[in-house]
């Protein structure tokens, strides 16, 4: 793989010596300000593996609302608009970072938390297990 | 006005940069430790809208490695294994939070950053614009 030269003065984030508690500026910088990404807003309906979006809410977490995808069908939508069970709709999942107050109710102390979210669905060929 | 009792166990915020800068514990708690989600690791090959995964590495960011999806085709793979251009492979994107060292190379000082990542691809029916 590609090796990025590390600053010898900086700890590696995968390293056991990586700092446990750090200072973080909460004034979020948006890396995508100049881009105008095509909104995937209607893909959930137009996909051959369509999904519904469910609201996962937790006021003690940031972001407080996360929209989770749930595939509508076990199979995929074919050219005739019917569900084809020879194919499978599966969720595409991603681990994301969220913030949680820790200790609880402390206004300026947080903990990073990693959660797995389903972002959307894709249509895949099933894995067929042949009986010996 | 309402007076909020300060929790003596909370970190002090008498810093001149308060309250833009807060303490964050990076000893990440994984909410999904007890779950064993089906790895979506092979979906990128089995999908009718397959994608390649590109390693986006940045030692000044946490996490330093993010895998970005790029759809392999404009169209989708049909039952014969050929690309069908009557359908479109499109990336499913999500905004995620990351930490960036700020100032650069400082081990214990970060800024929250929001970036748009492509997590995978899905196959959608195209939007057809009819010429009047």
């Amino acid at each position: 793989g590609i090796t990025i030269p590390r600053n010898p003065g900086c700890p590696n984030s995968e390293d056991k010596n990586f700092p446990r508690t750090v200072m973080v500026n909460l004034n979020i910088h948006n890396r995508n300000t100049n881009t105008n990404p095509k909104r995937s807003s209607d893909y959930y309906n137009r996909s051959t593996s369509p999904w519904n979006l469910h609201r996962n809410e937790d006021p003690e977490r940031y972001p407080s609302v996360i929209w989770e995808a749930q595939c509508r069908h076990l199979g995929c939508i074919n050219a005739d608009g019917n569900v084809d069970y020879h194919m499978n709709s599966v969720p595409i999942q991603q681990e994301i970072l969220v913030l949680r107050r820790e200790p609880p109710h402390c206004p300026n102390s947080f903990r990073l938390e990693k959660i797995l979210v389903s972002v959307g669905c894709t249509c895949v060929t099933p894995i067929v297990h042949h009986v010996q | 006005g309402i007076t909020i009792p300060r929790n003596p166990g909370c970190p002090n915020s008498e810093d001149k940069n308060f309250p833009r800068t807060v303490m964050v514990n990076l000893n990440i708690h994984n909410r999904n430790t007890n779950t064993n989600p089906k790895r979506s690791s092979d979906y990128y090959n089995r999908s009718t809208s397959p994608w390649n995964l590109h390693r986006n590495e940045d030692p000044e960011r946490y996490p330093s490695v993010i895998w970005e999806a790029q759809c392999r085709h404009l169209g989708c793979i049909n039952a014969d294994g050929n690309v069908d251009y009557h359908m479109n492979s499109v990336p499913i994107q999500q905004e995620i939070l990351v930490l960036r060292r700020e100032p650069p190379h400082c081990p214990n000082s970060f800024r929250l950053e929001k970036i748009l990542v492509s997590v995978g691809c899905t196959c959608v029916t195209p939007i057809v614009h009819h010429v009047q």
């Epitope: 807003s41 209607d42 979006l53 | -």
Partner: antibody, heavy 124, light 109 residues
């Protein structure tokens, strides 16, 4: 640019239904990055959020506890507008009613576009 | 329900002076979901600041916001004649908890 245009009667009798409409231009009522809400303002209550609708593969309705039993917010996708209905009104419902777009990006939430406001008086 | 208490109720200042407006929440709110609005007589509120410290499009640099937890501040570094108005803070804690402060009136001394 995005604009919201309110319409509806300025006088409603007690026990009747208050009905207002908000027409959207420059955005869509079924946008996935916005919610569409109603807020009212009176000298006694100040600014009071009443409720919102948002579309994320289906319509979501969220209503303030104070009016939950009396309020309905509906979208009209064909006309790209949304409406407020408040049943069984009393003189305490007299206020300036605003429709507003709530930016709902997961990472932020705020009202960036407001209608011009409609003064609704509840009186016989 | 989270109560937002703004202080002072009225601020009497002269053009060119610095205005500091306070908004205190009855419990912790995420700074990312805290906004400030300006309202002039007969007009709808206008967004000034979102995410506690981000200026909305077209808002002059003399307006700045800060704060986290329960204490938030709106600062106008040097008052212009058009800045005399009522200012409101607003928080979003959950889909059913969205409240405004009672407002601070900035008037000409």
């Amino acid at each position: 640019q995005v604009q919201l245009q309110q319409s509806g009667p300025g006088l409603v009798k007690p026990s009747q239904t208050l009905s207002l409409t908000c027409a959207i231009s420059g955005d869509s009522v079924s946008s996935s990055s916005a919610a569409w809400g109603w807020i009212r303002q009176s000298p006694s209550r100040g600014l009071e959020w009443l409720g919102r609708i948002s579309y994320r593969s289906k319509w979501y309705n969220d209503y303030a506890v104070s009016v939950k039993s009396r309020i309905t917010i509906n979208p009209d996708t064909s006309k790209n507008q949304f409406s407020l209905q408040l049943n069984s009104v009393t003189p305490e419902d007299t206020a300036v009613y605003y429709c507003a777009r709530e930016v709902d990006s997961m990472y932020y939430s705020y009202f960036d576009i407001w209608g011009q406001g409609t003064l609704v008086t509840v009186s016989s | 329900e989270i109560v937002l208490t703004q202080s002072p109720a009225t601020l009497s200042l002269s053009p060119g002076e610095r205005a500091t407006l306070s908004c205190r929440a009855s419990q912790n709110v995420w700074a990312f979901y805290l906004a400030w609005y300006q309202q002039k007589p007969g007009q709808a509120p206008r967004l000034l600041i979102y995410g506690a410290s981000n200026r909305a499009t077209g808002i002059p640099a003399r307006f700045s916001g800060s704060g986290s937890g329960t204490d938030f501040t709106l600062t106008i570094s040097s008052l212009e004649p058009e800045d005399f108005a009522v200012y409101y803070c607003q928080q979003y804690r959950s889909t059913l908890s969205l409240t405004f402060g009672q407002g601070t009136k900035v008037e000409i001394k």
